[in-house]
């Protein structure tokens, strides 16, 4: 069997491999050692017994999308059946005091690989043996602690594979400089040690994307905006736009990034090198926001100008890279893949990212202020509680609801919240009466709201003991 027979549904073409050469990866036309690494089709009954106590699930994630030329990182995490975990030595053990369907286990080990590897023979003192090899026969790398790594991960994409020895979690990074743009498929097969051979325990696949557009996301924040995710904002208040560039491999770290904004309200173009910008819309309506991000990034060099034409045709100056079947190198001239040049690492290319949003601007409550507080006199005998009137003004649209949140002096522990509808005239002057239980200092958060906005003001007030001579004090506003 070949690797593509084991790892994929369909044999990838040489064309795919030639156009997507991954550094350090091998052609999936290579032979797979089926004696050491048995191959089970989906639905094979042997999968049921491939792991003690249930099935292992592999979760494959990536930091896709990747800007072409950057690195994309794939992570595989193994999820073991309930009550099982990997210990520091790489053995699989039962968690203490954890009960699964089989109850508590007397044996602490699910798989005690340490004991097995210490017993193993035929290693001629070097730790090298015919079974410490990957499916293509390459020996395991013998770095310190390699014996504690009991899982073999085979990654497969674009007609190529990469083998890795690891624990219950591994990461692999791939440079995308030679990868065709668009969605691609990564498949991973995981084997575990089993005596002097290996047993498949999980298979997983995931789509990743390589793009020549900088992946751009924009968050928008505006004070008093009731719902920041609905792309409806308020007139006459600044909106803060924050640009997030998805660049997990820091490919653009040394690039100068320019942000070109068009807010769609005839205020022209705004160019900045800062990833945040504030903009205030002064008219109601619907506006088309456009952002173009530009970065000079490492990239392919333009081809050299063609040499002057000789009088009779001669072979071109192009570099010829021979492309052979990995097992049977052919004679010179067999299936040449002509590349116009070897890419120069030092070239820069402008990369662009785009973001577009439609923003709706509406009237909203712009500001709220408490202009007066009055202690409402109560008839004797004095009750425990105090009634206080807050005289409130607002600017902008007319509120439909008022809420007061009364809390401790740190404004962290809420004592009570009261909301009520309000009917306010054009002047936006209203009185809010609230009850305070006992004397002391209180934090009062007062909000005025309508469908789209929510304006807040806060104050600390001191409610005195019920002595008529004690004035009500606004501690600070």
């Amino acid at each position: 069997k070949r690797f593509h027979d084991v790892l994929g549904n369909e044999r990838p073409s040489a064309y795919m491999r030639e156009h997507n050469q991954l550094n350090g990866w091998s052609s999936d036309e290579n032979d797979w050692n089926e004696k050491l690494y048995p191959v089970w089709k989906r639905g094979d009954m042997r999968w049921k017994n491939s792991w003690k106590g249930g099935r292992v699930q592999a979760v494959l994630t990536s930091d896709s999308p990747a800007l072409v030329g950057s690195n994309i990182t794939f992570a595989v995490n193994l999820i073991f059946p309930r009550c099982q975990k990997e210990d520091a030595n790489g053995n699989i053990v039962y968690e203490k005091n954890c009960r699964n369907e089989a109850g508590l286990s007397a044996d602490p080990y699910v798989y005690n690989w340490t004991a097995w590897s210490e017993d193993s023979d035929g290693e001629n003192g070097t730790g090298q043996s015919h079974h410490n090899v990957f499916p293509d026969g390459k020996p395991f790398p013998h770095h310190p602690g390699w014996r504690r790594w009991n899982f073999i991960y085979v990654f497969h994409t674009l007609g190529q594979y990469f083998q890795k020895l690891g624990r219950c979690s591994v990461r692999v990074s791939v440079n995308t400089a030679n990868v065709t743009l668009g969605p691609q498929l990564m498949e991973v097969t995981v084997y575990r040690r089993h005596g002097r051979a290996y047993v498949p325990i999980a298979q997983v696949k995931d789509v990743y994307v390589v793009t020549d557009q900088i992946p751009v996301f924009v968050t928008m924040f505006q004070k008093n905006d009731r719902n920041s995710s609905d792309e409806t904002f308020l007139k006459d208040l600044p909106i803060m736009f924050d640009v997030l560039i998805h660049d997990p491999s820091h490919f653009l770290n040394y690039s100068t990034i320019n942000y070109k904004w068009s807010f769609g309200d005839n205020t022209g173009l705004f160019v900045s090198t800062n990833h945040t910008v504030n903009h205030t819309y002064v008219l109601n309506g619907t506006f088309s926001l456009n952002l173009t991000v530009k970065a000079a990034a490492p990239g392919p060099c333009p081809p050299p100008p063609p040499p002057p034409r000789p009088s009779k045709p001669t072979p071109s100056l192009a570099t010829t890279l021979k492309s052979y079947d990995s097992n049977t190198p052919g004679p010179a001239g067999d299936n040449p893949l002509e590349l116009s040049r070897i890419p120069d690492e030092n070239c820069q290319i402008n990369r662009y990212g785009h973001f577009q949003a439609t923003i709706t601007i509406v009237e909203g409550i712009l500001e709220v202020n408490i202009i007066q507080m009055t202690d409402v006199l109560m008839p004797v005998p004095w009750p425990e509680s105090s009634l206080i009137d807050f005289v409130v003004t607002c600017q902008g649209s007319i509120p439909t609801e008022v809420c007061t949140i009364i809390s401790d002096p740190t404004c962290e522990i809420t004592q009570n919240t009261v909301c009520s509808p309000v009917d306010v005239d054009e002047m936006c002057l209203l009185t809010v009466r609230r009850t305070f239980n006992g004397s002391g200092t209180y934090c009062v958060n007062l909000t005025l709201g309508d469908d789209t906005s929510l304006a807040l003001t806060s104050t600390l007030i001191s409610v005195p003991d019920r002595d008529p001579a004690s004035p009500l004090r606004m501690a600070n506003s």
């Epitope: 064309y15 156009h19 072409v68 065709t180 743009l181 020549d212």
Partner: antibody
Framework: QVQLVQSGAEVKKPGASVKVSCKAS????????MHWVRQAPGQGLEWMGE????????NYAQKFQGRVTMTVDKSTSTVYMELSSLRSEDTAVYYC????????????WGQGTLVTVSS | DIVMTQSPDSLAVSLGERATINCKTS??????LAWYQQKPGQPPKLLIY???KRYTGVPDRFSGSGSGTDFTLTISSLQAEDVAVYYC?????????FGGGTKVEIK
């Protein structure tokens, strides 16, 4: 929708060069390799080569090596194929065709450009 | 280079009858083989890719089969509009190659 529009017919003398253009629209131009295929009158299809608009890498069929040059103008999403030292047997319809991702089959073709080489 | 041998060169079939075209490659290209239909004055039109996958919008009377080095295009019930030249193409490796073509006519 994807469209490949080629330049008009050309008549050339032997020994001259011809440059055929293929303007792409309806997709991300830099994401797909563009190929050139020719067809002599009453004959079959013959693959000439391909170019990657993203980095301008080219692969040419051995038969055309040294005579063909494929180039790209990203600003206009146009691919060019120049064939030099023309001979009468280069009389053919020249097609541009777009590959699909990592697969070299062609769902999209230009309308073709007839190049006639005659003294 | 991979050599493509298409047979027969021409084929006359009655309307509603089955037409079968063969394509043989000099080395294993499986499953990277495509089939095209070309009518006079038009560019080729993709019918089948990866040996057996019908391209979007292609009538289901067209089917592709085969593996390794032997592939077949079948038109299960020939219609008048199927009169054309049919080409196979290997998309396994560069240089890409086309078969010599099969002309399908109505008997």
């Amino acid at each position: 929708q994807v469209q490949l529009v080629q330049s008009g017919a050309e008549v050339k003398k032997p020994g001259a060069s011809v440059k055929v253009s293929c303007k792409a629209s309806g997709y991300t131009f830099t994401s797909y390799w563009m190929h050139w295929v020719r067809q002599a009158p009453g004959q079959g299809l013959e693959w000439m080569g391909e170019i990657n608009p993203y980095d301008q890498r080219t692969n040419y069929a051995q038969k055309f090596q040294g005579r063909v040059t494929m180039t790209v103008d990203k600003s206009t999403s146009t691919v060019y194929m120049e064939l030099s030292s023309l001979r009468s047997e280069d009389t053919a319809v020249y097609y541009c065709a777009r590959s699909t991702g990592n697969y070299a089959w062609f769902a999209y073709w230009g309308q073709g450009t007839l190049v006639t080489v005659s003294s | 280079d991979i050599v493509m041998t298409q047979s027969p060169d021409s084929l006359a079939v009655s309307l509603g009858e089955r037409a079968t075209i063969n394509c043989k490659t000099s080395q294993d290209v499986s499953p990277s083989l495509a089939w095209y239909q070309q009518k006079p004055g038009q560019p080729p039109k993709l019918l089948i890719y990866s040996a057996s996958k019908r391209y979007t919008g292609v009538p289901d009377r067209f089917s592709g089969s085969g593996s390794g080095t032997d592939f077949t295009l079948t038109i299960s019930s020939l219609q008048a509009e199927d009169v054309a030249v049919y080409y196979c193409q290997q998309h396994y490796s560069i240089p890409l190659q086309f078969g010599g073509g099969t002309k399908v006519e109505i008997k």
